[in-house]
């Protein structure tokens, strides 16, 4: 079992319903919205998390929309279609039959079309650049200490191997975290960089997805690291296909 057995909860995803109805009375957790069983020893896929987020009652929602700066999805939140593994389906459509193609992190990568739009494959996002600006501090953080702390965070909290943290750049007050993960490099059981980036983004915004875990308290040598602005850029293995009209807008 991977859920917390004693009180049957999902430590890695609070947007679940858990009950001891698994094999041998083991705790089993299902994501809200999709009802899909999730592995609570690792991160839940972004697609299932977005679906759960959209299914939450509007009046009880404790999670807020991304800020105007977030480049996760310029189109804002949507209720995605997920495949049986919890990944985004390559083609997403809304209730008014407007469709578009997305990448593996669910970000639109084509112009919007109608139901005839074809999305042949789910294109993998293999490079994510997380751009942070921290609040003013007495002095700059030591670069190697900052690098070590961020790698520890991604390893221990998000279970992302440091080999997928390609680099940590720092020019006060800007921190850039580069996540890279080619299809060939990602082994079974490896956390996807898109899922790790999403959990990190939500943690930074004070909207932690973890069950009963304190909010993110980032410290470098005891000094609090408080983020005041986040931008996330996605690079796909195949470049996106937008019309020139959008590119020149």
């Amino acid at each position: 079992h991977t859920a917390a057995q004693d009180n049957c909860t999902c430590p890695t995803n609070k947007m679940t319903v858990c009950s001891p109805d698994g094999p041998g009375g083991r705790c089993q957790c299902r994501a809200l919205g999709s009802g899909m069983a999730v592995d609570c020893s690792t991160l839940t896929s972004k697609c299932l998390l977005l679906k759960a987020r959209m299914s939450a009652p509007k009046n009880a929602r404790t999670l807020v929309r991304p800020s105007e700066h977030a480049l996760v999805d310029n189109d804002g939140l949507y209720d995605p279609d997920c495949d049986p593994e919890g990944r985004f389906k390559a083609r997403q459509c809304n209730q008014t039959s407007v469709c578009w193609c997305v990448n593996s992190v669910g970000v639109r990568r084509t112009d919007k079309g109608d139901l005839s739009l074809r999305c042949d494959e789910l294109v993998r996002t293999h490079h994510i650049l997380i751009d942070l600006r921290h609040r003013p501090t007495a002095g700059a953080f030591n670069h190697s200490d900052l690098d070590a702390e961020l790698r520890r965070l991604f390893r221990e909290r998000y279970r992302l191997h440091p080999k997928f943290v390609a680099a940590v750049h720092y020019e006060q007050p800007t921190i850039q975290i580069e996540l890279r993960q080619n299809t060939s490099q990602k082994a079974a059981g490896d956390v996807d960089i898109g899922d790790a980036a999403y959990y990190f983004e939500r943690d930074i915004k004070g909207e932690s997805l973890f069950q009963g875990r304190g909010g993110l308290d980032l410290r470098v040598r005891g000094e609090p690291l408080q983020v005041e602005r986040t931008l996330i850029y996605y690079l796909d293995e195949i470049p996106p296909k937008f019309s020139m009209k959008r590119l020149t807008a």
Epitope: P11, D147, R157, P162, K163, E178, R213
Partner: antibody, heavy 118, light 111 residues
Framework: QVQLQQSGAELVRPGVSVKISCKGS????????IHWVKQSHAKSLEWIGV????????TYNQKFKGKATMTVDKSSSTAYMELARLTSEDSAIYYC???????????WGQGTTLTVSS | DIVLTQSPASLAVSLGQRATISCRAS??????????MHWYQQKPGQPPKLLVY???NLESGIPARFSGSGSRTDFTLTINPVEADDVATYYC?????????FGGGTKLEIK
């Protein structure tokens, strides 16, 4: 400063089990997973597995599945490793350790010497 | 599992001379410019002590006579000049892939 304090040496009979401990101090215990490493004359250093101090779940080296069981007690900042059905091949020094930024072993316990003998 | 082959198994060097220890991995341990290879020193009765991380980065407090080099599958630890205090066993370790694995060790003695 970061310290990992391990339990004392053990002399046990073949076939029994033993549980060794590793108490962490000088850092936030749940911020770091605890790894266990075996050192024997025959096989140099071998990674046994890791337990998440926060989640409480363990990942084992295939070779030690069924031999080692790792647990953690957050309230006392202590990790435990139980070794079952002991044989002379389990005689070794067992270390607990914490990882650094690039998954090198940054901090080590002083080691627990296990001798299995009839 | 990634197998690390260290050579030589033992090494006798005169004080003030150079000691070179080699570690070969069964597959590449590099990822996006980072080599996930590390070196440790172990003295009798003590746990291993980190000397060099990521192939060539000297751990804080380690004397500059220790240096590491290499990439992909071939790595080297160099001690120059060797001092009496360097008598120990040296291990390489890869952390590119689970399970982490160690080399068989190289015992350094003074000639």
């Amino acid at each position: 400063q970061v310290q990992l304090q391990q339990s004392g040496a053990e002399l046990v009979r073949p076939g029994v089990s033993v549980k060794i401990s590793c108490k962490g101090s000088g850092y936030t215990f749940t911020d770091y997973s605890i790894h266990w490493v075996k050192q024997s004359h025959a096989k140099s250093l071998e990674w046994i597995g890791v337990i998440s101090s926060y989640y409480g779940d363990a990942t084992y080296n295939q070779k030690f599945k069924g031999k080692a069981t790792m647990t953690v007690d957050k309230s006392s900042s202590t990790a435990y490793m139980e070794l079952a059905r002991l044989t002379s091949e389990d005689s070794a020094i067992y270390y607990c350790a914490l990882l650094g930024a690039y998954n090198y072993f940054d901090y080590w316990g002083q080691g627990t010497t296990l001798t299995v003998s009839s | 599992d990634i197998v690390l082959t260290q050579s030589p198994a033992s090494l006798a060097v005169s004080l003030g001379q150079r000691a070179t220890i080699s570690c070969r991995a069964s597959e590449s341990v590099d990822s996006y410019g980072n080599s996930f290879m590390h070196w440790y020193q172990q003295k009798p009765g003590q746990p291993p002590k980190l000397l060099v991380y990521r192939a060539s980065n000297l751990e804080s407090g380690i004397p500059a006579r220790f240096s590491g080099s290499g990439s992909r599958t071939d790595f080297t630890l160099t001690i120059n000049p060797v001092e009496a205090d360097d008598v120990a066993t040296y291990y390489c370790q890869q952390s590119y892939e689970d399970p982490p694995t160690f080399g068989g060790g190289t015992k350094l003695e003074i000639k």
